[in-house]
């Protein structure tokens, strides 16, 4: 086992140099010191070590820093960053935006989206800000990475980033993510008025409360059915037939094609059938006339 072998006499290196290229793998394991590698990371990147040799160096660094690399080493990683996993990165503590931007440049075009996202999450966790510069440094990575961050990380994202988010970016967000992002979007778009406001905020409406949706229904927004379907069930079921009619405007007719699918089905289930009948769309599934809802999950006959 390579771990058990001792370093041969005279083979212990005092600096990183080309001689190490000619070491056997077991000799690198036995002789190279992790702290020396950390001090001379620039040379590790300059010398044409093989992938296998670099993997050994990484193993040595991991053993030297089992709790995660210190920021002084992270700043010097350069191209060695390509050998680091997202799991490694989650252990780091990164506070310098310059370190993040440098490493994001290294990762560009290297199929390293997971590492890039982990790095930014780690930076946010340490109190950093995901400003527009950082978003630009993330380059072509879709903003769906916002949903890869934990809800805790999202607290650090500035509201201004919401201007850059598109509808598809939030597809895999949890409800908690959407709630936090919706609050940030409200803050970002607070000085936008009228229909322009609705166009911007509709991407985030999956995080809106029933109170927010009621307020929106007063503004003739004519919400499309695709946006309506993204609303959270808990918020939607609190709206009356009249409020949904105001919210959708002429698009109310599109409810018919969605009546057997969530969340429209869930909403229909909570409405009185007589109110649905007034819409004249043939919508079914409401509370039958003469029934009284005593509990959200149970229908009881009114007697």
């Amino acid at each position: 086992d390579a771990e058990q072998k001792a370093c041969p006499p005279g083979k212990e290196p005092y600096k990183v140099d080309e001689d190490l290229i000619f070491y056997q793998n077991w000799e690198l394991e036995a002789c190279v010191d992790g702290t020396m590698l950390a001090r001379q990371m620039d040379l590790v990147n300059e010398i044409p070590f093989t992938y296998e040799q670099l993997s050994i160096f990484k193993h040595k660094l991991d053993k030297t820093y089992p709790q995660g690399y210190p920021e002084s080493l992270i700043q010097q990683l350069g191209h060695f960053f390509r050998y680091v996993s997202p799991e490694d990165i989650h252990q780091w503590n990164v506070t310098s935006p310059d370190t993040v931007k440098t490493l994001l440049k290294v990762s560009k075009g290297q199929k390293m989206n997971a590492q890039a996202i982990a790095l930014v999450a780690c930076y946010l966790r340490g109190g950093g800000q995901l400003d527009e510069d950082m978003v630009k440094a993330l380059g072509d990575i879709p903003l769906s990475y916002l949903c890869d961050f934990s809800p805790q990380d999202l607290h650090s994202v500035p509201s201004s980033v919401m201007w850059l988010v598109g509808p598809q970016d939030l597809d895999k967000c949890s409800q908690r993510h959407l709630g936090l992002l919706y609050q940030k979007a409200c803050s970002a778009f607070q000085n936008v008025s009228g229909l322009e406001y609705f166009e911007k905020i509709k991407t985030f409406l999956g995080g809106a409360s029933v109170k927010d949706l009621r307020a929106l229904s007063q503004h003739n927004v004519s919400m499309d059915i695709a946006t309506f379907k993204r609303l959270q069930v808990d918020s939607l079921v609190g709206l009356s037939v009249a409020e949904v009619q105001k919210l959708l405007g002429p698009n109310i007719v599109d409810l018919k094609t969605e009546e057997d699918k969530s969340p429209v089905r869930d909403w229909l289930f909570r409405q009185h059938q007589k109110d649905l009948d007034r819409l004249g769309l043939g919508l079914q599934g409401g509370i039958p006339n003469g029934y009284l809802v005593l509990d959200f999950n149970v229908r009881e006959a009114f007697s």
Partner: antibody
Framework: QVQLQESGPGLVKPSETLSLTCTVS??????????WSWIRQPPGKGLEWIGY???????NYNPSLKSRVTISVDTSKNQFSLKLSSVTAADTAVYYC???????????WGQGTMVTVSS | DIQMTQSPSSLSASVGDRVTITCRAS??????LNWYQQKPGKAPKLLIY???SLQSGVPSGFSGSGSGTDFTLTISSLQPEDFATYYC?????????FGGGTKVEIK
Amino acid sequence: QVQLQESGPGLVKPSETLSLTCTVSGGSVSSGSYYWSWIRQPPGKGLEWIGYIYYSGSTNYNPSLKSRVTISVDTSKNQFSLKLSSVTAADTAVYYCAREGKNGAFDIWGQGTMVTVSS
Amino acid sequence: DIQMTQSPSSLSASVGDRVTITCRASQSISSYLNWYQQKPGKAPKLLIYAASSLQSGVPSGFSGSGSGTDFTLTISSLQPEDFATYYCQQSYSTPLTFGGGTKVEIK
């Protein structure tokens, strides 16, 4: 390693306010990686999440208790606290403080403190 | 609120048995599902997070699976120390909610 310890009176009178404190040791309540939650368990029953606080002071409460709950954080003392007003016998439970990590799970819990609401 | 329904509510098994507990969410929660073990007079202990990831220090006899609305906790070979109550919990949406629990008793 990180430990949580609940403290506060074990007996509260109906209509009064229940006050509990959770002290964090071996770690910091100011860490941006965690939400700090209160969870309760009535005798012989299941678990109910009360709410959580982030180090910045941002809170999220269970709507079923929202009108009566306040959770606060004191970063200088490395503590967070729960206040539940207008208590009734239905609030009798073991109250736990817990840490929610970035994976969305409660990875560390206090040992719990039994609070009885009775006159 | 998302309702979490566990089944069975209790079961009797012997040491060495393979035990399966299921948890169903009232709406899709992706993989935002955690499992806990609780023994009498003690705080719950995290076993599985994100539906299938084993928490550090938890024996490999515990495993979790599922996504969307249906989830399973499996104990591959029941040990004497595994007799306890097990809870699932969703972290997809607030309020965070728990299942009603499954009590695993000695047959």
